[in-house]
Interface confidence: medium
Amino acid sequence: QAGPLPKPTLWAEPGSVISWGNSVTIWCQGTLEAREYRLDKEESPAPWDRQNPLEPKNKARFSIPSMTEDYAGRYRCYYRSPVGWSQPSDPLELVMTGAYSKPTLSALPSPLVTSGKSVTLLCQSRSPMDTFLLIKERAAHPLLHLRSEHGAQQHQAEFPMSPVTSVHGGTYRCFSSHGFSHYLLSHPSDPLELIVSGSLEDPRPSPTRSVSTAAGPEDQPLMPTGSVPHSGLRRHWE
């Protein structure tokens, strides 16, 4: 009788990484014929929430007035039209920051680095953690995970970059987390500005960060080279 209904689109505003206590709105956009929307949260009884559509019926709003650990997780949404339920949306991972104290981010040997040389970004936490994330501002794919194996916890993770090019320049932050929930992150570290100079083999100037432009090399995932310095840590690309 019916072909599968198109899957809805699921997103969060102002974003999917939310500080503890801040508000977030989850939006599910279906079709103009939708009668109701359902939001399911992984490992929670379904449906996690139901909403009637907003006019003109092609989307629904799910409001979280104050972000807490309970809201962090993986969500999918569905809509129901006169002919039945849609396919599930692609998942939305809602991450809460502020669950743990902030780590410290530093650059070795220095945040001022000559193009072609090596630099290592070091993320250190006060208490032992098993996951560290390095995030570059304004990158389309900002997350690089270093996760410890066998639950061994570490106080720090190293993110080596070699050879450095102008693409690596920019503002970085890091987070730490426990493996039992990678949806709960620490407060962000203070920002670290990595400045790349003397790019003789790469005449392109280091991209400015004041204006977000069309996708370019800086929007690619950070790809450090070399072996992972801590034997207990394994690199994960997200």
Partner: antibody, heavy 118, light 112 residues
């Protein structure tokens, strides 16, 4: 104002196919669904199928193997194609606009009469 | 599929008198969104159907207020407080709650 107008063949031989066009005005096919309903002579109404605003289609299960509905948004036209016609497919064929608030048909075309006969 | 049963099949009424048509569905038409998608259509001889009532009781624009729709669940009624000559024709109920949409067999309103 909203209008729907069906046009198609008047007489078709058994086992042949038919295509009926519904030309709409006063609304956009990108925002509204269109249904097809038929009415055999002296009988009641039978829902045939729908093409939703996004282009997805659904059909009456008893007829879906013989029905195809598609549309051209830019020409404001919806097409009903039906194959392997039999005499009991003789009917007035209507297109109707879907109104989303009440999920009902708020405007109907004037209908086109199809006779299946050898 | 949901079966819609209308009674009576024919209704003979004197002009100026009330009329009532019943429509019964084989399943409840109350949707999980809280709405009941029960509609009434009117068709004059030789013309296309016209929407009278949707969501049980909401009158389409231009429909005189002598028409009222009521009911819930599986039992619904269309009432005309005073029949006028222009009301003669066939009345259909149909449901949009369950897929596929289904129509009643129609009630013919004629002059006594």
């Amino acid at each position: 104002q909203v209008q729907l107008k069906e046009s198609g063949p008047v007489l078709v031989a058994p086992s042949q196919s038919l295509s009926i066009t519904c030309t709409v005005s006063g609304f956009s096919l990108t925002n509204s669904a269109v249904h097809w309903v038929r009415q055999p002579p002296g009988k009641g109404l039978e829902w045939l199928g729908v093409i939703w605003a996004g282009g997805n289609t659904n059909y009456n299960s008893t007829l879906m193997s013989r029905l195809t509905i598609n549309k051209d948004n830019s020409k404001s036209q919806v097409f009903l194609r039906m194959n392997s016609l039999q005499t009991d497919d003789t009917a007035i064929y209507y297109c109707a606009k879907h109104e989303t608030y009440g999920d009902s048909f708020d405007y109907w075309g004037q209908g086109t009469t199809l006779t299946v006969s050898s | 599929d949901v079966v819609m049963t209308q009674t009576p099949l024919t209704l003979s009424v004197t002009i100026g008198q009330p009329a009532s048509i019943s429509c019964r569905s084989s399943q409840s038409l109350l949707d999980s969104d809280g709405k009941t998608y029960l509609n009434w259509l009117f068709q004059r001889p030789g013309q296309s159907p016209k929407r009278l009532i949707y969501l049980v009781s909401k009158l389409d624009s231009g429909v005189p207020d002598r028409f009222t729709g009521s009911g819930s669940g599986t039992d619904f009624t269309l009432k005309i407080s005073r029949v006028e000559a222009e009301d003669l024709g066939v009345y259909y109920c149909w449901q949009g709650t369950h897929f596929p949409f289904t129509f009643g067999s129609g009630t013919k309103l004629e002059i006594k």
